[in-house]
């Protein structure tokens, strides 16, 4: 006799208003008496509709939460698994049931903001900027909301960057415990003349950090050929172990690049009689602290003061 199990009931994808952090939830299947004491597991697959691959989760719970790109629709499917100790070792699963979440198509795509860019300056404050939609009326203005796990609800930006009395960006500081988790942003708009399409963005703050440039550069030459360059990590909350550096060294008319995770570097002079020996450096968050990052501006150039040429007597 073939063993069968029903799919979960009332599978749905719910939006609690957290700008892309959605709830996928369901109820247990109707289970025949024989399997009442069995452990049920649920295999959940979900994706944004334009994605080739499904994300798969196995859970014994009745809810799963994850972040999505709300610029696109979402689809999910779920089925029940019976543990093999209830089925004499055979794998028993129900048919799939499906659910979807459609995005709002209010407002044409041309009304949506363009070129959204966000930078987390020195791991201290976030600046996001955007351009108005391609075709919008002059009364259009935009509003930015954000949410990350730890906030009770989505918050509106309190410090807008403005151009011609229109919001074109936002500055956020005091973002407590907001890194290493998804940070959700929605920029929506209003106009008396037409609806405006909302724009959604999600990223993790540690991956968009732009540090301050290194400071207190120093260069010295020992034994007339060994160059030693050192610099200080910039001030602020980024731990020294989180930096990687790119250095440009200039010896007369020749310059070359080097890289290190330390805040000093040693190398040999290319020519003993070189008259000009300078370097400058920039930094970014390294792979041990983030998956990505933005290079700082270059530091001021520092040159070796120790050279004494034939005309210096």
């Amino acid at each position: 006799l073939e063993i069968k199990v029903n799919p979960p009931q009332d599978f749905e994808i719910l939006d609690p208003g957290l700008l892309g952090y959605l709830y996928l939830q369901w109820k247990p299947p109707v289970v025949i008496e024989k399997f009442k004491g069995c452990t049920l597991e649920y295999e959940l697959k979900y994706r944004n509709v334009d994605s080739d691959s499904w994300k798969t989760i196995i859970t014994r719970n009745l809810i799963y939460k994850d972040g999505f790109d709300l610029n696109k629709g979402i689809e999910g499917k779920i089925r029940t698994h019976l543990s093999e100790h209830c089925t004499n070792g055979s794998e028993v699963q129900s048919p799939w049931i499906e659910a979807s979440y459609g995005i709002s198509d209010e407002g044409s795509l041309e009304t949506k903001i363009q070129d959204m860019k966000c930078i987390y300056y020195n791991w201290q404050y976030l600046v996001c900027s955007w351009k108005p939609g391609k075709t919008v009326y002059s009364d259009t203005n935009y509003t930015m909301f954000f949410w990350y796990e730890g906030l009770d609800h989505a918050l509106q930006c309190a410090d807008y960057l403005q151009h011609d009395e229109k919001n074109v960006g936002c500055k956020l500081s005091n973002l407590d415990s907001s890194d290493y988790k998804d940070f959700f942003i929605c920029v929506n708009g209003s106009s008396k003349l037409e609806p405006i399409r909302s724009s959604y963005t999600v990223f993790q703050l540690q991956n968009i950090v732009k540090p301050l440039p290194p400071e207190f550069l120093h260069i010295s030459v020992e034994n007339s050929i060994d160059i030693r360059m050192k610099w200080s990590t910039p001030g602020g909350p980024i731990p020294p172990r989180c930096y990687t550096y790119e250095i440009v060294i200039r010896e007369d008319d020749i310059s070359w690049e080097s890289a290190t995770d330390k805040n000093d570097m040693k190398l040999k002079r290319r020519a003993n009689e070189s008259e000009d020996l300078c370097f400058f450096v920039r930094c970014k968050v390294n792979i041990y602290c983030a998956d990505d990052g933005i290079w700082s501006e270059w530091s001021e150039e520092e040159c070796w003061e120790g050279y004494t040429g034939p005309d210096s007597k």
């Epitope: 989760i57 014994r60 543990s83 070792g89």
Partner: antibody, heavy 121, light 108 residues
Framework: EVQLLESGGGLVQPGGSLRLSCAAS????????MTWVRQAPGKGLEWVSA????????YYADSVKGRFTISRDNSKNTLYLQMNSLRAEDTAVYYC??????WGAGAFDYWGQGTLVTVSS | DIQMTQSPSTLSASVGDRVTITCRAS??????LAWYQQKPGKAPKLLIY???SLESGVPSRFSGSGSGTEFTLTISSLQPDDFATYYC??????????FGQGTKVEIK
């Protein structure tokens, strides 16, 4: 008596490959899900990968996804872990583990003795 | 991912003491939690599954309790053989299966 015996560990250079095997005995191998768990020197336990009883579904930790492949041969009572593009941070003792009950994972009731994988140049 | 946090990281105790180790999940995991004991150079050993079920062959001085997000492993009277590192593990939702960072029980 349930026994899980891992083999295939050793020293490998970064970027290299290794295939771990786990010979199982003392239970009906095709029934339970099986997993690999690793432990870096002096560190805690890290789940690596799981495979269902039939071998039809596999699951991976993000840290190894795309580099490691779990498989099983139920006719030979053997579990495998193919490890490619190895990195220094993959250095660990790798344990072959039987799942007590559950589709792809659950409580782990039997563990092998472990095999050491060292990734170093 | 579900994070598992154990406390304390290290626990100093004497033979005969009652010892309690806590494990906290970042979200509800019902009763889908296991406890393991590991001695240096050895593989972990299952003590408790489904939060409170004692694995066959494990001494009854070990017990587990809790549900949702808060769990405890209790050793009612610590024996010389119990000095080891203990790990909790959730299997409510995966991938990934996640472990606590471990609690080392050492001799006072």
């Amino acid at each position: 008596e349930v026994q899980l015996l891992e083999s295939g560990g050793g020293l490998v250079q970064p970027g290299g490959s290794l295939r771990l095997s786990c010979a199982a005995s003392g239970f009906t191998f095709r029934r339970p899900a099986m997993t690999w768990v690793r432990q870096a020197p002096g560190k805690g336990l890290e789940w690596v990968s799981a495979i269902t009883g039939s071998g039809g579904s596999t699951y991976y930790a993000d840290s190894v996804k795309g580099r490691f492949t779990i498989s099983r041969d139920n006719s030979k009572n053997t579990l495998y872990l193919q490890m490619n593009s190895l990195r220094a941070e993959d250095t660990a003792v790798y344990y072959c583990v039987k799942v007590r009950y559950g589709w792809g994972a659950g409580a782990f009731d039997y563990w092998g003795q472990g095999t050491l994988v060292t990734v170093s140049s | 991912d579900i994070q598992m946090t154990q406390s304390p990281s290290t626990l100093s105790a004497s033979v005969g003491d009652r010892v309690t180790i806590t494990c906290r999940a970042s979200q509800s995991i019902s009763s889908w939690l296991a406890w393991y004991q590991q001695k240096p150079g050895k593989a972990p050993k299952l003590l408790i599954y489904d939060a409170s079920s004692l694995e066959s062959g494990v001494p009854s001085r070990f017990s587990g309790s809790g549900s949702g997000t808060e769990f405890t492993l209790t050793i009612s009277s610590l024996q010389p053989d119990d000095f080891a590192t203990y790990y909790c593990q959730q299997y409510d939702t995966y991938p990934p299966i996640t472990f606590g960072q471990g609690t080392k029980v050492e001799i006072k």
